[in-house]
């Protein structure tokens, strides 16, 4: 089951503390299960499981992927996991932590010398292959730091969105990736509806921007639902 | 200053059903995942039920499944916990969870950054 799996999400960030004020950060720590940590004059106590669950690897941390967390595990769920190292086994480039990407199922370094060839031919490879995501498609998408000194501007080759400029995110563009402005209010958006349908984006849209959501627009309620339009709007 | 306050906790019978809500107030950020967590007395605080970003993905703790159901409303910034065929063990405080993030904003690992106060259960049998 889930609650089985690899612990990648252990004590990401921690509750307040007993007595203390709602809505205050926690901080991150890692520990074992049943982490004591102080509140006030008591102590309390945490399971250090805490799935994160995600549709997109934007939505994990930078040193984390999005993915069903077991083979067979769950229909349906995704949480983040953490990042696989250097020589460690992938499917697509977001499973390889920052400075690395994956390279016929092996996470390799982002060598600057490299760079373009290789990263523009795995990324080809992947969009044409089923087998080359966890699920069937492609997400976390940027270069690592390594590649780029300066984060992408809008129409820049990345793999990971986190090496594009602010404001910028890292989406398919034909069988390459790069910056794209990430949308605005009333911007149409795309709302996955099918688990697996990235793969069918030729030019793949950014997600909303800050306090945006994508949403059916109020006119378009009563059309069929494969013609629904989807735009960023106000929470 | 940003605020989660829950709401729907009470008593019920074994076999009663109860809706939590959570609202998250205050802060100019993005909701990205929300959770349930719940603590009984002596035990350690463990994870209920989660939701992702944009609802698709919803993640339930084993005891949980076919029981209870989280959903989101992002217009409301809220997260509800629908509890159903409530047992004894269910009793706890439960407490909701959010990871709010500034935009462009994320963190090296994913998590809930933004926490309520909770709210009691009690299930009688």
């Known amino acids: 089951t889930l609650n089985s799996v690899l612990n990648s999400n252990a004590i990401k960030n921690l509750p307040p503390p007993l007595g203390g004020a709602a809505g205050h950060p926690g901080s991150a720590v890692s520990a074992a299960p049943g982490i004591l940590y102080p509140g006030g004059n008591k102590y309390q106590t945490i399971d250090n499981y805490q799935p994160y669950p995600c549709a997109e690897d934007e939505e994990c941390g930078t040193d984390e992927y999005c993915a069903s967390p077991t083979r067979g595990g769950d229909a349906g769920v995704q949480i983040c996991l953490a990042c696989r190292k250097r020589r460690k086994r992938c499917m697509r480039h977001a499973m390889c932590c920052p400075g690395n990407y994956c390279k016929n199922g092996i996470c390799v370094s982002s060598d600057q010398n490299h760079f373009r060839g290789e990263i523009e031919e795995t990324i080809t490879e992947s969009f044409g292959n089923d087998h080359s995501t966890l699920d069937g498609y492609s997400r976390r998408t940027t270069l690592s730091s390594k590649m780029y000194h300066t984060k992408g501007q809008e129409g820049s080759v990345c793999l990971r969105s986190s090496d594009c400029a602010s404001g910028l995110c890292c989406a398919r563009h034909f069988w390459s990736k790069i910056c794209k402005p990430v949308l605005k209010e009333g911007q149409v958006c795309t709302k996955h509806r099918r688990k697996g349908s990235h793969g069918l984006e030729i030019f793949q849209r950014c997600y909303c921007g800050e306090g945006l959501s994508c949403r059916i627009q109020k006119d378009h309620h009563q059309a069929s639902n494969s013609s629904r339009l989807h735009t960023c709007q106000r929470h | 200053e940003v605020q989660l306050v829950e709401s729907g906790g009470g008593l019920v019978q074994a076999g009663g059903s109860l809706r939590l809500s959570c609202v998250v107030s205050?802060?100019?950020?993005?909701?990205?995942?929300m959770g349930w967590f719940r603590q009984a007395p002596g035990k350690l605080r463990e994870i209920v039920a989660a939701?992702?970003?944009?609802?698709?993905?919803?993640y339930y703790t084993d005891s949980v499944k076919g029981r209870f159901t989280i959903s989101r409303d992002d217009a409301k910034k809220t997260v509800y916990l629908q509890m159903n065929s409530l047992k004894s063990e269910d009793t706890a405080v439960y407490y909701c969870?959010?990871?709010?993030?500034?935009?462009?904003?994320?963190?090296?690992?994913?998590?809930?950054?933004?926490w309520g106060q909770g709210t009691q259960v009690t299930v009688s049998s």
């Open positions: 939701i992702s970003r944009t609802g698709s993905s919803i």
């Open positions: 969870a959010v990871d709010g993030r500034a935009n462009g904003e994320r963190p090296a690992v994913a998590g809930y950054n933004y």
């Open positions: 205050g802060g100019t950020f993005s909701v990205y995942a």
